[in-house]
Amino acid sequence: ALDAAYCFRNVQDNCCLRPLYIDFKRDLGWKWIHEPKGYNANFCAGACPYLWSSDTQHSRVLSLYNTINPEASASPCCVSQDLEPLTILYYIGKTPKIEQLSNMIVKSCKCS
Amino acid sequence: ALDAAYCFRNVQDNCCLRPLYIDFKRDLGWKWIHEPKGYNANFCAGACPYLWSSDTQHSRVLSLYNTINPEASASPCCVSQDLEPLTILYYIGKTPKIEQLSNMIVKSCKCS
């Protein structure tokens, strides 16, 4: 799996999970989240050569097409596969609210 | 929806469905498929600016991050959303076989 256990160790040029810490205030301009101040969002990036973690038959076809027609810009892309939620604390007036934001943390990647 | 009805009419710079005809023999080196000789595979391509057909909360966060930090290359990517199968005819010896290859045709796209 193209997850932290593999990708953070191997720093692949191909599609892999990349660490990314996001500071809510500095990086997103969000002042409404009280805790946490930021989180390890991670993201997916890297090349998608033929058969590198292809998600579908179409992405396999596309990467093979791209191998044979390298001048074409039709190639698969490295995107998130498994995502996890993030629990946040914010306030409405003086009332604290705890909420789980779904699909905030990328855990693994794929070529799609 | 970022499908043919919208994308083929509007020729968007942003993430959209793009037409792509694939000739099995010429483009993939596949000689085993007897019919069809090729098919409209299509593919997804284009920019993923903030809120342009974002797939998940993470892709929305990432596109906002990329807006505020444009020098970073951590941005969502335009990939297939809905896919359809393709029915093919091939031969094993002299015996014709009809098979449905799943996820061969892209019908719509998303930023993920």
Epitope: A4, F8, R9, V11, P19, L20, Y21, F43, A45 | -
Partner: nanobody, 119 residues
Framework: QLQLVESGGGLVQPGGSLTLSCAAS????????MSWVRQAPGKGLEWVSV????????HYSDSVKGRFAISRDNAKNTLYLQMNSLKPEDTAVYYC????????????RGQGTQVTVSS
Amino acid sequence: QLQLVESGGGLVQPGGSLTLSCAASGFTFSLYPMSWVRQAPGKGLEWVSVIGSDGGTKHYSDSVKGRFAISRDNAKNTLYLQMNSLKPEDTAVYYCAEGDSRYVRGRTRGQGTQVTVSS
């Protein structure tokens, strides 16, 4: 709070050597790849090197390949950059960064350490 403190810079003659260090705190250092980036006077940030979390995989920019060596000591939460055969064009402020700076550019946390190569 994630903190990175670079040290080891200085003035060195062309052909000389230096070893930069980066002390990391506030996160689980051993789980993350780490990078070195640099900023020459009047220029943007340039990626120099990246090392995998266990130190096994290393990549270098073409401009430093064969001259610089990245390493890490996970027990000490420290990243290193051994710089040999230094050239005047290596003059820059050097920063360490968490993650793979080939993909997330323009982000530095520490104050950096100045390296000047001049005769």
